[in-house]
């Protein structure tokens, strides 16, 4: 009787089962969330899982469907989208992906009043952007880089602009560069809020520097691949923003915007637009030397039909000890009295926090405050203001959503999910419906990801909308690792880390550490998430410790850490890499002769820098398509860093910090280089250099390539990638197979 | 299941107005957004008023500022008062959800403008 619980406790264990490399592969323990796709204060469509699109109303508790699965796959629709006024609806096909964000496709409109696809006058195929207009059903689209618009879905197109040509002139849609580092989206075009006016961008890329490499094929001969792509002190785009009136397009046709003269002094990025009201426009712009940045707000002028923005409102932001802004320059948030706005910006702690400015930056009026930053303010409605930070329990690598009255004196702040699930939900992000009269909760860990919907008054959950529970059955019986998240103290600087153990994991054995790193600025890897992934089953199955460090240049814990790597890109990245190995063979758990690092993109440049640091600490280690030199890469992304690589600029860095410069380092380690040779973002030049640099030094060293795989290493790459680095390391850590 | 009935059609000089009515019955009530639509003689029916659970209304252009959508939930009805009529609002005049679903449309009611 006393040994029965005993055994029925051991035979429970013995059904666990270890993570397999076949179960991260083919996605078996992979989570939903649910974003609505609000269309109203109170109303959402979501496509259901047999593919209908269904309209929910969350007042009346009824829920139909307005577009059946059976008119979706007449015409193979994997996307749609509504016209607000309710008629129309558009429905994607033949997507085709370009670059990171862009991606072709074939549009077709379906008429909901009259249950039929509608004939005539049909787009063109296939097309780079479409979209509704706010109120209505207008169209805006972008054909081979021009932009036409139609007053209705049946209507003849009226052609906005005439001059776009293929990698030259770009139109409502961005060039490669602006695409990946400055916009984040695969349009540039924006209706005004009652679409009245349309503005756009047209990105001038006639005398930008190509990058031309081979793509393989099944032909007889590769095809070459031309992108107009700005390295690092290359000549830019040339960018002007238009805008035109919707209703009269041929009156005076687009008008020009102009550009803050402190600005147009010099080289400049236009970085974004804010529509506040029809005839207020806001702009944002950058000096190439990306310290300056200026926000513009614009008015229309009846009288000439042109757009004015006067200096005095102008208002300028300026980082002294590093870059303006985080990644991006953050984007205004406007108020009702449509002038005054909300935005995120450094405090004189050196904190990112959200400030109110009325008249001028300098009278900005902080609504945050304290030790941890401000990350996303997700609406301003005319009584609260809602927004994420890692303020609580001071863990940087959290999220919480939180409500600021901003109706009653003095302002009262409310932490609106601190406390909903706090085991199972330490980061959130939200989507709000208009008014915000409901939200949606996402809740992505560090338990099984769960989506919530709520009252925006009162903040109470009314339904969930997504809770995993097939993945939470899935999981109970898999001997997941275990997670912890905590900080090392060294030198005055805070090193979060994540560790992530073997599920037996006895702190008095030995066990191989891997070093998973990214490390770029503003990135964060420490973050309160659930993941079931590669590490995840290396940790699981095959017993190995596993280690994510945010070392200096890293975000959301302030400027001294996050512009500690101004201008010196390589250096202390790594550095708080080996710290923190350092400190974690010190906690005794480690096998100090079974030590790796792997690392991709920016990580595989700081993986390449750590195993040449001649520290010996590493054993071995894995750089996938890493950069390895700054002069390779973008522009945008690499200058706001470093500055220009001119000897009166920061030239000297720009050499000192490439992997090849250390190329005799790696003899004493076991490096395995990866890298697609169709990799647009990090050009396999930047590996094509190292090879060449080891070569030379005759040293030895693994690699492989996949043949016309970009920066992400998608589909079947993945599991050869995955299977290949996994054998590398169990061969690295005398692991049996 | 569900029934839409409209009501309050008919011949009026150009300038007048009509108020219509649409009695909604079966499963869905009168709360969820709903629309006016009107097709008229040879052309595509089309979107005229719609009115969010909300109260949030959205117009066709060319009724903006004379027509007006409301609804009784009591009543569980829904309306379009019509005003400043043009010969060119002559149609048939039904309601639905809005957006419409296929299934939902009733027989309508008729409004012609004599000028």
């Known amino acids: 009787i006393v040994l029965r619980p005993s055994r029925v406790h051991n035979s429970e264990e013995n059904t666990m089962r270890a993570l397999t490399l076949k179960d991260i592969l083919n996605g078996t323990f992979s989570y939903k969330t649910f974003f609505p796709n609000w269309i109203s204060g109170q109303e959402y469509l979501h496509q259901s899982a047999d593919n209908n699109i269904v309209l929910y109303n969350i007042e009346t508790g009824q829920s139909y469907t307005i577009l059946s699965n059976r008119t979706m796959k007449s015409v193979n629709a994997s996307n749609y989208g509504l016209s607000p006024d309710r008629q129309f609806v558009y429905l994607e096909s033949d997507y085709s992906k370009l670059w990171r964000y862009s991606y072709t496709a074939t549009y077709y409109i379906y008429d909901l009043s009259n249950g039929e696809f509608v004939r005539g006058n049909e787009l063109p195929r296939p097309i780079q952007y479409l979209c509704w207009s706010p109120v209505g059903s207008k169209l805006a689209y972008v054909y081979q880089n021009n932009i036409y618009l139609k007053q209705r879905p049946g209507d003849p197109p009226f052609q906005i602009t005439f001059n776009g040509r293929e990698n030259k002139i770009f139109n409502g849609i961005p060039d490669w560069v602006y695409e990946e580092e400055m916009l984040a989206t695969k349009y540039a075009l924006w209706w005004s809020p009652n679409g009245k006016f349309l503005a756009y961008a047209e990105f001038n890329d006639t005398d930008i520097p190509v990058i031309a490499y081979s793509y393989y094929g099944d032909e007889q001969y590769p095809r070459t691949i031309n992108i107009p792509y700005p390295k690092a002190g290359a000549k830019n785009p040339v960018v002007r923003i238009f805008i035109i009136d919707t209703t009269y397009p041929a009156y005076v046709g687009p008008q020009e915007v102009p550009v803050p003269a402190m600005i147009a002094s010099s080289d400049y990025y236009f970085s974004w637009l804010t529509w506040v009201t029809d005839e207020r426009v806001c702009l944002q712009w950058l000096k190439r030397v990306q310290n300056v940045s200026v926000l513009s707000i614009c008015d229309f002028r009846e009288d000439w039909q042109t757009w004015d923005c006067p200096k005095t409102q102008e208002h300028i932001e300026e980082s002294r000890t590093g870059w303006a802004g985080g990644f991006f320059v953050s984007t205004p948030v406007f108020s009702y009295d449509a002038i005054s706005y909300y935005k995120i910006f450094s405090d004189k702690d050196g904190y990112k926090h959200i400030h109110y400015i009325k008249d001028t930056v300098e009278n900005a009026i902080q609504i945050t405050s304290g030790k941890w930053e401000a990350i996303n303010i997700f609406r301003v409605t005319q009584d609260s203001l809602f927004y994420s930070s890692n303020e609580f329990e001071e863990y940087p690598g959290r999220r919480n959503i939180y409500r600021i009255s901003i109706g009653s004196y003095p302002p009262s702040k409310k932490c609106v999910t601190c406390h909903l699930r706090k085991e199972r939900c330490q980061y959130y992000t939200a989507s709000f419906s208009d008014y915000a009269k409901y939200y949606a909760l996402v809740c992505y860990g560090p338990g099984i990801p769960i989506s919530t919907l709520h009252d925006g008054r009162t903040d109470q959950e009314i339904k969930i909308l997504e809770e995993n529970k097939e993945l939470e059955n899935a999981l109970k019986n898999i001997q997941l690792p275990k997670e912890e998240i905590k900080k090392l103290e060294v030198d005055e600087i805070t090193l979060w880390y994540k560790m992530i153990l073997p599920p037996q994991f006895d702190r008095s054995k030995k066990y191989p550490l891997l070093i998973q790193v990214y490390g770029g600025p503003c990135s964060q890897s420490v973050r309160s998430v659930f993941a079931v992934n590669w590490i995840s089953y290396l940790a699981s199955k095959e017993g190995m410790v596993i280690a994510l460090v945010d070392g200096r240049g890293t975000a959301f814990q302030g400027d001294k850490l996050l512009y500690a790597v101004y201008r010196k890109l390589g250096v202390y990245e790594v550095e708080d890499q080996i710290t923190a190995v350092r400190k974690f063979i010190e906690m005794g758990f480690i096998d100090e002769k079974r030590i790796a690092i792997w690392g991709w993109s920016y990580g595989g440049y700081v993986s390449s820098l750590a195993l040449a640091s001649g520290t010996g600490l590493f054993k071995c280690g894995i750089a996938v398509a890493p950069v390895s030199s700054w002069e390779y890469y973008a522009s945008v992304y690499t200058e706001r860093f470093m500055g220009l690589p001119t000897k009166d600029d920061n030239l000297e860095h720009y050499k000192n910090s490439t992997v090849m410069a250390r190329a005799e380092y790696f003899r004493n380690v076991d490096y395995l280089l990866i890298h697609g040779t169709a990799d647009d973002n990090v050009h396999f030049q930047n590996s094509a250099q190292i090879a060449k640099a080891l070569v030379n030094a005759q040293v030895d060293f693994q690699a492989m390539w996949y043949s016309d795989q970009n920066h992400g290493l998608s589909g079947l790459s993945t599991n050869h990638l995955y299977t290949h680095m996994t054998h590398f390391l169990k061969q690295c850590f005398s692991l049996s197979d | 299941d569900v029934q839409l009935v409209e009501s309050g059609g008919g011949l009026v000089q150009a300038g007048g107005s009509l108020r219509l009515s649409c009695a909604v019955s079966g499963s869905i009530s009168s709360a969820n957004s709903m629309g006016w639509y009107r097709q008229a003689p040879g052309k595509q029916r089309d979107v005229v008023a719609g009115?969010?659970?909300?109260?949030?209304?959205h117009y066709a252009d060319s009724v903006k500022g004379r027509f007006t959508i409301s609804r009784d939930n009591a009543k569980n009805t829904v309306y379009l008062q019509m005003n400043s009529l043009k010969a060119e609002d002559t149609a048939v005049y039904y309601c639905?959800?809005?957006?419409?679903?296929?299934?939902?449309w009733g027989q309508g009611t008729q409004v012609t403008v004599s000028s």
């Open positions: 009115l969010t659970t909300g109260g949030r209304s």
């Open positions: 639905n959800l809005w957006p419409p679903v296929q299934g939902y």
